[in-house]
Interface confidence: low
């Protein structure tokens, strides 16, 4: 025996109560699919939340956020706040990028700025909260005997030339090894800082401007989840 | 925060109506769906309707579709049901609910909730 | 409409130990299921939506499951606190339909 109610088009319900007869969805309402027996309640667009498609007899209504928000999750069901460029935001609402990361967006999280030391480059245009740093050419190819404008040197002797080349890639390698030094050093005294607080007593701790800044910026403790801070759910 | 204030009981003869109130507080009332429950002593939960404040639109569970009729007054943020020719069947726990705010479909879940009003039908 | 079966309607239990409550619906739900906590002489409180969420400030020992038409709530080492009544509800379709309860009593 064929069920009566798979006769009921989209944006009716087979109504149990009618004898089975099929009912144009009340209201507020939709069926998006034939032989139902109930019609769903239409999605209200509420809030922070605005209609993006009204709901029909046959389809749900669809939202999408006020301007300042943007949506997340499947089909919308979130509201985020936006954050302006060079912000991320975090539980506390939107906060600046730290020193060294950036956003060039007004959603998601502050990213590091690109190493150019890694590709073997150098920092062409520093990085700002809103922008990556631009490499350009490595140090090798900025150096005066790279360049492709020189004027013809004088010619010397075979052995002359090879002692300046290797006195010029002896200094640039102590240098590079200088630097990275340096690096390492400010990086495990700032770890040993940071384990061992205890170590270094207060007169250590100079109120820069840099430490100032810290305090405003979106620096994420590991228990600290991103986002949360501004979403809006329907 | 959101707030659902009920009156602690109300005793009504069998047979008169009686019209149970359920004031809103700390939202916008107008934007989130009213449900009401009936809870009889001992017993489960069963969902009576809910009505939309800004349009007054209304669903019901056939079961009180004849006898419970759902209004609201948006000027006062209130919401009332009102029970016509209640019998012993119906003294029970009203109370009012609120949908949550949770991403769509979860909306539909009853995040909020009013004290409950205690009806008895007694002569 | 869709019927929910819940069970036990009573269980017995000691603080520390771990039950578990399940609802059968009717028909396919697909995950459209509440959980409420009642305690003695007050309101039903949103503990599970979505048949797995836990709701806001629910602490982590109560979980959700299930799909189809079979779920369940468990809850972890039991405390004082959860004793009560627990409610499933579906909100797939009109009429919302709850569970009859299971009443938790400490043993």
């Known amino acids: 025996l064929q069920d009566p109610c798979s006769n009921c088009p989209a944006g009716t319900f087979c109504d149990n109560n009618r004898n089975q007869i099929c009912s144009p969805c009340p209201p507020n309402s939709f069926s998006s699919a034939g032989g139902q027996r109930t019609c769903d309640i239409c999605r209200q667009c509420k809030g922070v939340f605005r209609t993006r498609k009204e709901c029909s007899s046959t389809s749900n209504a669809e939202c999408d956020c006020t301007p300042g928000f943007h949506c997340l999750g499947a089909g919308c069901s979130m509201c985020e706040q936006d954050c302006k460029q060079g912000q991320e935001l975090t539980k506390k609402g939107c906060k600046d990028c730290c020193f060294g990361t950036f956003n060039d967006q007004k959603r998601g999280i502050c990213r590091p700025w690109t190493n150019c030391s890694l590709d073997g480059k150098s920092v062409l245009v520093n990085g700002t909260k809103e922008r990556d740093v631009v490499c350009g050419p490595s140090p090798a190819d900025l150096s005066p005997g790279a360049s492709s404008v020189t004027p013809p040197a004088p010619a010397r002797e075979p052995g002359h030339s090879l002692q300046v080349l290797t006195l010029f890639l002896a200094l640039t390698s102590a240098l590079l090894l200088a630097l990275i030094f340096i690096t390492l050093l400010f990086s495990v005294l700032k770890w040993i800082r940071k384990k061992f607080p205890h170590i270094f007593k207060q007169p250590f701790k100079k109120t820069t401007g840099a430490a100032q800044e810290e305090d405003a910026c979106s620096c994420r403790c590991p228990q600290e989840e991103e986002g949360g801070g501004g979403g809006y759910e329907l | 925060q959101v707030q659902l204030q009920q009156p602690g009981a109300e005793l009504v003869r069998p047979g008169a109506s009686v019209k149970l109130s359920c004031k809103a507080s700390?939202?916008?009332?107008?934007?989130?769906?009213i449900n009401w429950v009936k809870q009889r002593p001992g017993q489960g939960l069963e969902w009576i309707g809910n009505?939309?404040?800004?349009?007054?639109?209304?669903n019901y569970n056939q079961k009180f579709k004849d006898r419970a009729k759902l209004t609201v007054d948006k000027s006062s943020s209130t919401a009332y049901m009102q029970l016509s020719s209640p019998t012993s069947e119906d003294s029970a726990v009203y109370y009012c609910?609120?949908?949550?705010?949770?991403?769509?479909?979860?909306?539909?879940?009853?995040?909020?909730w009013g004290q409950g009003t205690s009806v008895t039908v007694s002569s | 409409d869709i019927q929910m079966t819940q069970s036990p309607a009573s269980l017995s239990a000691s603080v520390g130990e771990t039950v578990t409550i399940t609802c059968r619906a009717s028909g396919n739900i697909d995950n459209y299921l509440a959980w409420y906590q009642q305690k003695q002489g007050k309101s039903p409180q949103l503990l599970v939506y979505n048949a797995k969420t836990l709701a806001e400030g629910v602490p982590s020992r109560f979980s959700g499951s299930g799909s189809g038409t079979e779920y369940s709530l468990k809850i972890n080492s039991l405390q004082p606190e959860d004793f009560g009544s627990y409610h499933c509800?579906?909100?797939?379709?009109?009429?919302?339909?709850f569970g009859g309860g299971t009443k938790l009593e400490i043993k």
């Open positions: 009505i939309f404040p800004s349009d007054s639109y209304t």
């Open positions: 700390g939202y916008t009332f107008t934007s989130y769906w």
């Open positions: 609910t609120r949908f949550g705010s949770s991403g769509y479909p979860d909306y539909y879940t009853m995040e909020y």
């Open positions: 509800q579906q909100y797939w379709t009109i009429p919302y339909t």
